[in-house]
Interface confidence: medium
């Protein structure tokens, strides 16, 4: 029965995840009569950031005034559908995924802003938004056409700690080199100078030997 709610799944995309060996087409064709149809819109293509983060909006056309909504992100790749993450939320409240979920999200009216983190090139695939109106009855189910998320792995960077050590070593080397250069330069300059000169030669008249000057006191009459 394709309309059954999927089991809650603590997902890491590239770990062993629960998969359904049926295509999404099969999933859609065999939705029983008790699943009321609901339109769900999502973007066709999204490019993940260099940090492996992809965000997209999932919008549903609510047939009634739902107070509890369940949003599930499914990934379709190689003819298999895998649950990535799921969250149930009360209208007006925050969307809360499991603590270890790779998804985060916010809700606003009939829109859910979903963010999937930790994506790598091998996670490229079709990400389908499934929306269920849980309360009040009747139950409604809507499945989007999917968002093709492209993930391009960035060029491998050196390890950050290693980079830090290189930076520290180069900085230290430059410091000591400049210190040494300054010291050598100063010593060379000092060798060229007379120890009693100031570095500027001025022709001076001959001086008499210093003698103690005698001062006569002045009498200043005060009227």
């Amino acid at each position: 029965m394709a309309c059954l709610g999927f089991q809650r799944h603590k997902a890491q995309l590239n770990l062993a995840t629960r998969t359904w060996p049926c295509t999404l087409l099969f999933f859609l064709l065999f939705i029983p009569v008790f699943c009321k149809a609901m339109h769900v819109a999502q973007p066709a293509v999204v490019l993940a950031s260099s940090r492996g983060i992809a965000s997209f909006v999932c919008e549903y056309a609510s047939p009634g005034k739902a107070t509890e909504v369940r949003v599930t992100v499914l990934r379709q790749a190689d003819s298999q559908v895998t649950e990535v993450c799921a969250a149930t939320y009360m209208m007006g409240n925050e969307l809360t995924f499991l603590d270890d979920s790779i998804c985060t999200g916010t809700s606003s009216g009939n829109q859910v802003n979903l963010t999937i983190q930790g994506l790598r090139a091998m996670d490229t695939g079709l990400y389908i938004c499934k929306v269920e109106l849980m309360y009040p009855p009747p139950y409604y189910l809507g499945i989007g056409n999917g968002t093709q998320i492209y993930v391009i792995d960035p060029e491998p960077c050196p390890d950050s700690d290693f980079l830090l050590w290189i930076l520290a070593a180069v900085s230290s080397g430059l410091f000591f080199y400049s210190f040494l250069l300054t010291a050598v330069s100063l010593s060379k300059m000092l060798k060229k100078r007379s120890p009693l000169t100031t570095g500027v030669y001025v022709k001076m008249p001959p001086t008499e030997p210093e003698c103690e000057k005698q001062f006569q006191p002045y009498f200043i009459p005060i009227n």
């Epitope: 089991q7 809650r8 029983p32 009569v33 008790f34 149930t88 309360y135 009747p138």
Partner: antibody, heavy 120, light 107 residues
Framework: QLQLQESGGGVVRPGGSLRLSCTVS??????????WGWIRQPPGKGLEWIGN???????YYNPSLKSRVTISVDTSKNQFSLKLSSVTAADTAVYYC????????????WGQGTLVTVSS | DIQMTQSPSSLSASVGDRVTITCRAS??????LGWYQQKPGKAPKRLIY???SLQSGVPSRFSGSGSGTDFTLTISSLQPEDFATYYC?????????FGGGTKVEIK
């Protein structure tokens, strides 16, 4: 095979509270596919829905009983409970716990029921 | 609240008879209706969900039909084990409500 077993039935004094538990075996109460509920049936009468609970703790009650009802879930014990306060003789009934799929607001598995009699 | 009215409240029939029980909702409920069978001292057992879908393990002699406000449970050929009370239940809006029941007795 899924089984639901009610416990806690018996005689309750008027004005007091009744507390019932339903233990689920052969399946997990933490499944995201199901809600768990309580339904009652006064002797010789029809069925009355009391409320539902989801493993996350979300609850839905019959508005006519809402002020007196509390349904809670204990996933570690794989059970859920019903508390009905300020009981009167009208609350004398067989109380059933049951399961429903999230897609359906009707119940596919039921416990065998436990009788609660409100009497002084 | 949506009122569910079942008719008849009781009926007598013989083994092999075709039995029809009707359920009327006080407002349109689309196909959000279930049928249950209850035997004395036992819990109800769901026979039909979504008005016409047969519950797994239930004999094919049971069938459901209808949409909107009028629904029917049909037992094509009554068997000895079918003598019981039958309830309809709407699952369209809160609170969930049941019909008053139809008791099927041996003629």
């Amino acid at each position: 095979q899924l089984q639901l077993q009610e416990s806690g039935g018996g005689v309750v004094r008027p004005g007091g509270s009744l507390r019932l538990s339903c233990t689920v075996s052969g399946g997990s109460i933490s499944s995201s596919s199901y809600y768990w509920g309580w339904i009652r049936q006064p002797p010789g009468k029809g069925l009355e829905w009391i409320g539902n609970i989801y493993y996350s703790g979300n609850t839905y009650y019959n508005p006519s009983l809402k002020s007196r009802v509390t349904i809670s879930v204990d996933t570690s014990k794989n059970q859920f409970s019903l508390k009905l306060s300020s009981v009167t003789a009208a609350d004398t009934a067989v109380y059933y716990c049951a399961r429903r799929r999230i897609q359906l607001w009707s119940f596919d598995y039921w416990g065998q029921g436990t009788l609660v009699t409100v009497s002084s | 609240d949506i009122q569910m009215t079942q008719s008849p409240s009781s009926l007598s029939a013989s083994v092999g008879d075709r039995v029809t029980i009707t359920c009327r909702a006080s407002q349109g409920i689309r196909n959000d209706l279930g049928w249950y069978q209850q035997k004395p001292g036992k819990a109800p057992k769901r026979l039909i969900y979504a008005a016409s879908s047969l519950q797994s393990g239930v004999p094919s002699r049971f069938s459901g039909s209808g949409s909107g406000t009028d629904f029917t449970l049909t037992i094509s050929s009554l068997q000895p084990e079918d003598f019981a009370t039958y309830y309809c239940q709407q699952s369209y809006s809160n609170p969930l409500t049941f019909g008053g029941g139809t008791k099927v007795e041996i003629k």
